[in-house]
Interface confidence: low
């Protein structure tokens, strides 16, 4: 079938259109184009005879049409009047006619639109603004853009006049945006330049910054005022109702208490004619004095004296604060505060109470700290310690002993041998000692301030023969899989070798066994019941050797899971039930029984004579080791059958 396709269908003025013929028959005489939907000689555009290849213009020919051999018609420089239908009349060689009609539409190329406004300076919450997209164009669609986005849905936005007018009712400051309009038709789309809506608003209630309202005498007062406003607000300051200046900032240097009062910022918008004010109350405080601490006892004695620290000066209606070691006061029954917090009393001072102590006076703005105070607590002397710890020496060596006792002020030391004063020094030195130097060596420490003395006595043995050693232990009853045990071979002697034996054998290699302190100490980690053996230590030097008595390690363990015997679980009615419970444990455990959950007796053996089927049930043995704090249990089911029936059979 003969058809006409318009390319394009929508044509812009000034452009061209091709009426393209499809399914053109063969063996043609010629064809002719007409304006309109039918063949009308008065509206013929052009005719074409194939044989002569001659084109003949018709009455409707405008000079802008070109006909092609394939019957397609090109129309150039399209004008608005070209819109409509075009009919192709084909005359075949047998002079049979065939017709086809096509059409196209012509649209103007749109100009760049512009936006006109009925109000260039609308006032917020009062005015409406109507934007109109210019010029008015037929067959054009109008679109609007706000900040390059399509229009939001809002009851305050209204399109009218075929979308050509955009009205914003009751404008707000948020409507300050870039507005564009766009015109569209099938052949073009043009967007206007943006129009910025300048909404007059405010001033809002001004904000005064900074927010703090309390100042110290001598500081600078610098207040700044800001109110959201378009155009920007004009600012005025009033102090206690009296106008000061028309600036956004108010600066008063070196303020005094007299500058206290109400400070008002007024913001004025000359375009909206509105004023808004905000008031802040400023309080200026006099500078308080720096506090200091006085003490009723500058040299208190430990565990004897109390100390009262007082924060000076005394000021009415003032809050006093205290700090110890830069921390707030700890909760302690030895610390007492007076009702006004001004006095801090330390009851029965200790050497740890030295401080430093600080007090503070709190005013409305800040806290003023005193300088720190340190207490000189007199203490000691504690029991002196004599070093080194050796008690056995060989003849011919030098004996050098040193004494130390914690004390404030530092202790004065004296040495006595067998009760006789030797010298008033911290160290005692005797060269080339002999057996005659054996004896009781006493160190006496004296605190001259407190008048207290403490002594320590050490027995020194000078002998070529080593004494018989002994074993001391840090844990006489260790718990299995929990405790460690450290054996130490005594005494500590110079130039001596220490040896160890377990059950008469030298020490086995084990990660749980560790020698330290010159082999003088043997540590067993994570003891087990197998470690309950005889331990012996030996000492030797170049002259002699000696061995300790054995020490047997008593390892607490268990109770292990108990065993109930006999193992039988089926009994005949009338038999005696005699159950015995046993659990490996050191010390021996306490036993108790429960039948069907009900406590029975606290014995190792449970005996029930002449049992019946009523004695069926669960029999539980509970074991408890009070030394290890551990418990264990086992449950056994007992079945009693009536006489004459075997277990597992029914009559």
């Amino acid at each position: 079938k003969l058809t006409i396709e318009s390319t394009p269908f929508n044509v812009a003025e000034g452009k061209e259109v091709l009426l393209l013929v499809h399914n053109l028959p063969q063996h043609l005489f010629g064809y002719s184009w007409y304006k309109g939907e039918r063949v009308d000689g008065n509206r013929q555009i052009i005719g074409y005879v194939i044989g002569t290849q001659q084109a003949t213009p018709g009455p409707a020919y405008s000079g802008r049409e070109i006909i092609y051999p394939n019957a397609s018609l090109l129309i150039q420089n399209i004008i608005q009047n070209d819109t409509g239908f075009y009919t192709l009349h084909v005359i075949k060689s047998d002079l049979v006619n065939e017709e086809a009609t096509g059409q196209f539409r012509v649209y103007p190329e749109l100009p760049k639109p512009s936006i006109s406004s009925n109000n260039s300076k609308p006032v917020e919450d009062k005015d409406a603004v109507a934007f109109t997209c210019e010029p008015e164009t037929q067959d054009a669609t109008y679109l609007w853009w706000v900040n390059n986005q399509s229009l939001p849905v809002s009851p305050r936005l209204q399109l009218s006049n075929g979308n050509r007018t955009l009205t914003l009712f009751n404008v707000t400051r948020n409507d300050t945006a870039s507005y564009k309009c766009e015109t569209q038709n099938p052949v073009s789309a043009r967007r206007s330049d943006s129009v910025i809506l300048n909404v007059l608003y405010g001033p809002d209630a001004p904000t005064i910054s900074p927010l703090n309202t309390s100042y110290r005498s001598g500081e600078n007062l610098n207040l700044s005022c800001h109110a959201a406003s378009n155009p920007p607000a004009q600012y005025s300051w009033f102090v206690n109702g009296t106008f000061q200046q028309s600036t956004q900032e108010l600066f008063i240097p070196n303020i005094t208490v007299n500058n206290s009062g109400s400070y008002t910022c007024q913001a004025h918008n000359s375009d909206t004619g509105l004023n808004r004010t905000t008031v802040t109350t400023i309080t200026v405080y006099a500078e308080p004095p720096k506090p200091f601490i006085t003490s009723n006892n500058s040299n208190p004695v430990e565990d004897e004296d109390a100390v009262a620290l007082t924060c000076e000066p005394e000021i009415q209606n003032t809050t006093y604060l205290w700090w110890v070691n830069n921390q707030s006061l700890p909760v302690s029954p030895r610390l007492q505060l007076s009702n006004d917090n001004r006095t801090l009393t330390l009851l029965s001072v200790t050497r740890n109470d030295v401080g430093p102590y600080e007090c503070g006076i709190q005013n409305e703005l800040s806290v003023d700290h005193s300088d720190p105070v340190i207490l000189n607590v007199l203490y000691g002397p504690d029991d002196p310690t004599i070093s080194p710890s050796y008690t056995y020496y060989r003849p011919g060596v030098n004996l050098s002993l040193s004494c130390h006792a914690a004390s404030n002020p530092p202790a004065q030391y004296s040495w006595l041998i067998d009760g006789n004063i030797q010298q008033h020094t911290q160290e005692l030195f005797i060269s080339n000692i002999t057996e005659k130097n054996s004896g009781l060596y006493t160190c006496q420490a004296n605190n001259s301030a407190s008048g207290h003395s403490r002594t320590t006595v050490k027995t020194i043995t000078v002998s070529a023969e080593l004494p018989k050693p002994s074993i001391s232990s840090n844990n006489s009853k260790p718990v299995e899989d929990k405790d460690a045990v450290a054996f130490t071979c005594e005494p500590e002697a110079q130039n001596t070798t220490y040896l160890w034996w377990v059950n008469g054998q030298s020490l086995p290699v084990s990660p749980r066994l560790q020698l330290s302190n010159g082999n003088r100490t043997l540590t067993l980690f994570n003891v087990t019941r197998n470690d309950a053996r005889a331990y012996v230590c030996g000492i030797q030097n170049s002259v002699s050797a000696n061995r300790s008595d054995p020490v047997t390690l008593d390892v607490l363990y268990g109770p292990d899971t108990p065993i109930i015997s006999p193992p039988d679980s089926s009994y005949l009615s009338g038999a005696n039930l005699n159950l015995s419970c046993h659990s490996a444990s050191n010390p021996s455990p306490q036993y108790s029984w429960r039948i069907n959950g009900i406590p029975q007796q606290h014995t190792q053996v449970l005996f029930i004579a002449k049992i019946t089927p009523n004695n069926n049930g669960t029999y539980a043995c509970f074991v408890s080791n009070l030394a290890t704090g551990r418990n264990n249990s086992i449950v056994k089911s007992i079945t009693v059958s009536a006489s004459g029936t075997s277990p597992g059979l029914s009559a």
Epitope: P111, K112, P113, S114, S116, S117, N118, N119, S120, K121, E134, P135, S192, D193, P231, D271
Partner: antibody, heavy 121, light 111 residues
Framework: QVQLVQSGAEVKKPGSSVKVSCKAS????????MHWVRQAPGQGLEWMGR????????KYVPKFQGRVTITADTSTSTAYMELSSLRSEDTAVYYC??????????????WGQGTLVTVSS | EIVLTQSPATLSLSPGERATLSCRAG??????????LHWYQQKPGQAPRLLIY???NRATGIPARFSGSGSGTDFTLTISSLEPEDFAVYYC?????????FGQGTKLEIK
């Protein structure tokens, strides 16, 4: 209705300054621009510059830049044009005219009556 | 700046005749396809009076015999039938861009 009343005629010496006022009524001058145009005797119209009374922003023809100052007082709805360093060729009638969407649809629909400034030694 | 050239400088016609005044801009004064060109009439001793704004719109109170046309750079003021009070000087002005320039004027005088 829109009215523009200009100050009276002035005779000035060369080198001095003149300040012409233009009081507006019937509209808010903050909604418009105020323009100044002058016309020398027997000559055509010459645009001098304009001001936006809402913010005080002004714009001048380069020829007058540095000699002309246009101001506005929104509280009295009055615009001013001050021309300094006067010379004889500044003898002209000076007009004020509002310009903007509200009042004149982007043309000069209303004019002051004009102020004749004569510069003569 | 945009230079406006008016022609003719003087036009001598009789009442009742048709007057055509031309104003040519050195560059387009169109904004969004609308010519921002205006026509003013001035009589001796008077301030200018707006006749036509934006190329073709009659100002308030202007008789219908005054019409304007044109776009881009070429604009025409037409007075269809001259009345005695129409004899005056006519100026065109562009407000497309600063500075807002005027043409040098066309004097319409009685023949």
């Amino acid at each position: 209705q829109v009215q523009l009343v200009q100050s009276g005629a002035e005779v000035k010496k060369p080198g001095s300054s003149v300040k012409v006022s233009c009081k507006a009524s019937g509209f808010n001058i903050k909604d418009t621009y105020m323009h100044w145009v002058r016309q020398a005797p027997g000559q055509g119209l010459e645009w001098m510059g304009r001001i936006d009374p809402a913010n005080g922003n002004s714009k001048y023809v380069p020829k007058f830049q540095g000699r002309v100052t246009i101001t506005a007082d929104t509280s009295t709805s009055t615009a001013y044009m001050e021309l300094s360093s006067l010379r004889s060729e500044d003898t002209a009638v000076y007009y004020c005219a509002p310009f903007g969407y509200y009042v004149s649809d982007y043309a000069m629909a209303y004019w002051g009556q004009g102020t004749l400034v004569t510069v003569s030694s | 700046e945009i230079v406006l050239t008016q022609s003719p400088a003087t036009l001598s016609l009789s009442p009742g005749e048709r007057a055509t005044l031309s104003c040519r801009a050195g560059e387009s004064v169109d904004i969004f396809g609308v010519g921002f060109l205006h026509w003013y009439q001035q009589k001796p001793g008077q301030a200018p009076r707006l006749l036509i704004y934006r190329a073709s719109n009659r100002a308030t109170g202007i008789p219908a015999r005054f019409s304007g046309s044109g776009s881009g750079t070429d604009f025409t003021l037409t007075i269809s039938s001259l009345e005695p009070e129409d004899f005056a000087v006519y100026y065109c002005q562009q407000t497309n861009e600063d500075p807002y320039t005027f043409g040098q004027g066309t004097k319409l005088e009685i023949k």
